[in-house]
Interface confidence: low
């Protein structure tokens, strides 16, 4: 019950707090659990005890193991255990699960990522922050005290964030890094009846015979996560896949999220080598979601080959 997992990287500082709490006036003794050998309190040692804290300056893989702390007061003794694992530094960028601190969630309105365990260390600002091993740059990122603030959070901001700082002990500096995942949750979103932005209803699209033509069906469905929303093209009331004309294909465009937060989708209809008979077809842009379906119809007309101005 009174056991705590702690982990760190070799050649970095690691400070562990005794899982049993007591008043500052209580004494705390630390032992190697395996040997019951007392851990020294002299700061000249690489591993030493300092009240409720056990300090590895710096840590080595061989330090891994279980450490016992006993909080002593005039009336009781309380025992706790610190399960310490020191890992070798990874050569690649990937941070394994076992080195990750708890995942935090943020949203458009609240995007603080706290640097884990930093309160145990003697550090001075500023913190350095990295996302997926890349140093964070740009005005959207602000390192503030012991946390990172991200302005205008987007779903792309989700990922693994590493804070890096220097712990100072009696004039000696030791590096510390800590990584946690950040997920982005939507603010309370809403769903609308689909709004088709393009094409306009009954639009006439001019094309050149023998050339390629693209039609884009673009619609918005609300704000935030839209689980079931789709845009698609139909030819003469038939799905593209069922129409059976290999020259005419549809391709999903990128999901879009505009500055107003609306969630929108694009579907591009690609017509290769436009033929005379393509002008006879009815092209329907369909947008559908949980509220229903909206349809905009487009027809093709032959472009005047000598009027490139239009």
């Amino acid at each position: 019950k009174f056991s705590k997992q702690s982990w760190g990287l070799e050649n970095e500082a690691l400070i562990v707090r005794c899982p049993r709490q007591g008043k500052p006036s209580y004494t705390v003794d630390w032992y190697y659990s395996q040997t019951n050998k007392s851990i020294p309190t002299q700061e000249r040692n690489r591993v030493f005890a300092s009240g409720q804290l056990l300090k590895f300056l710096p840590a080595a893989v061989a330090d891994s193991g279980i450490y016992t702390c006993i909080v002593r007061s005039p009336t009781f003794n309380r025992t706790g255990y610190a399960n310490v694992t020191i890992y070798k530094k990874q050569s690649d960028c990937n941070v394994p699960d076992y080195l990750m601190y708890s995942t935090v969630s943020g949203s458009e309105k609240n995007s603080k990522i706290y640097c884990p365990t930093i309160d145990l260390y003697n550090w001075t600002a500023p913190l350095e922050w990295f996302k997926n091993c890349q140093a964070l740059q740009g005005s959207r990122y602000r390192a503030h005290k012991s946390f990172l603030v991200i302005d205008n959070v987007m779903t792309e901001d989700a990922g693994d964030y590493t804070c890096k700082f220097i712990h100072n002990e009696n004039g000696a500096n030791y590096s510390v890094t800590a990584t946690r995942s950040f997920t982005v949750k939507d603010e309370q979103g809403f769903s609308l009846f689909p709004v088709i932005g393009a094409p306009a209803q009954n639009e006439i699209k001019e094309v050149e015979i023998g050339k390629n033509a693209n039609l884009t069906c673009s619609a918005c469905f609300g704000k935030g996560t839209q689980f079931l929303a789709a845009v698609l093209w139909q030819l003469n009331g038939t799905k593209i896949t069922d129409f059976g004309e290999p020259r005419i294909q549809q391709e999903e465009g990128q999901n879009q999220s505009f500055s107003n937060g609306l969630a929108c989708l694009d579907m591009v209809l690609r017509i290769a080598d436009v033929k005379e008979e393509d002008l006879l077809l009815q092209y329907d842009c369909l947008a559908l979601n949980l509220h229903g379906l909206r349809r905009h119809t487009v027809r093709l007309s032959r472009k005047n080959p000598i009027d490139h101005h239009s």
Epitope: T225, Q226, F227, L228, A230, L232, T241, Q250, E252, G253, Q254, N255, L288, L290
Partner: antibody, heavy 118, light 107 residues
Framework: EVQLLESGGGLVQPGGSLRLSCAAS????????MSWVRQAPGKGLEWVSA????????YYADSVKGRFTISRDNSKNTLYLQMNSLRAEDTAVYYC???????????WGQGTTVTVSS | DIQMTQSPSSLSASVGDRVTITCRAS??????LNWYQQKPGKAPKLLIY???SLRSGVPSRFSGSGSGTDFTLTISSLQPEDFATYYC?????????FGQGTKVEIK
């Protein structure tokens, strides 16, 4: 014949990882929303995750958020579920399913069994 | 999340019987309700979508009705191959949720 075929299940210890795959054939995979649905032994169906056709939209049940990652490779017609930090309660048969335009799961794979036990 | 409650959780019936299973949503889901059949050791199979639309290839003895919060799956004349577990599922909002299932057994 339209079909989905899952693979990658097995026995894993708590805290371990597993990657499930689902190979799709005979439908326009790249435009299809896809989902993972699981069923614990003797229990009902539980939706796990969904992904849009181009992979830009991903959605997760609260019970797996932050631990599972859904992805797809449209060039290989394959759907994936990367499962990390597995727990005993993740033990289940995992099905991949196509999400039809109305939100019904209209095509299902045969399922792959994941057992999380020490 | 929207809760889906099925009743009964199990029932015994004979071949030829008319069987009705109900599904109730914790809030209105319009007609975004789907029904599935699952046999032991097999994947679920979609029977009905949008509350009342019969999936292509599904026998016409299966029918669905309802909208809002109350829905019904009816098997007009139970056949030997219909003994299975039936699930309802809402696709009105994320996350999609299923009912706990109704097991139809041979009397």
């Amino acid at each position: 014949e339209v079909q989905l075929l899952e693979s990658g299940g097995g026995l894993v210890q708590p805290g371990g990882s597993l990657r499930l795959s689902c190979a799709a054939s005979d439908f326009n995979f790249k435009n299809a929303w896809m989902s993972w649905v699981r069923q614990a032994p003797g229990k009902g169906l539980e939706w796990v995750s969904a992904i849009s056709g181009n992979g830009a939209g991903t959605y997760y049940a609260d019970s797996v958020k932050g631990r599972f990652t859904i992805s797809r490779d449209n060039s290989k017609n394959t759907l994936y579920l990367q499962m990390n930090s597995l727990r005993a309660e993740d033990t289940a048969v995992y099905y991949c399913a196509r999400v039809g335009e109305t939100g019904a799961f209209d095509i299902w794979g045969q399922g792959t069994t994941v057992t999380v036990s020490s | 999340d929207i809760q889906m409650t099925q009743s009964p959780s199990s029932l015994s019936a004979s071949v030829g019987d008319r069987v009705t299973i109900t599904c109730r949503a914790s809030q209105s889901i319009s007609s975004y309700l789907n029904w599935y059949q699952q046999k032991p050791g097999k994947a679920p199979k979609l029977l009905i979508y949008d509350a009342s639309s019969l999936r292509s290839g599904v026998p016409s003895r299966f029918s669905g009705s309802g909208s809002g919060t109350d829905f019904t799956l009816t098997i007009s004349s139970l056949q030997p191959e219909d003994f299975a577990t039936y699930y309802c599922q809402q696709s009105y909002s994320t996350p999609p949720t299923f009912g706990q299932g109704t097991k139809v057994e041979i009397k």
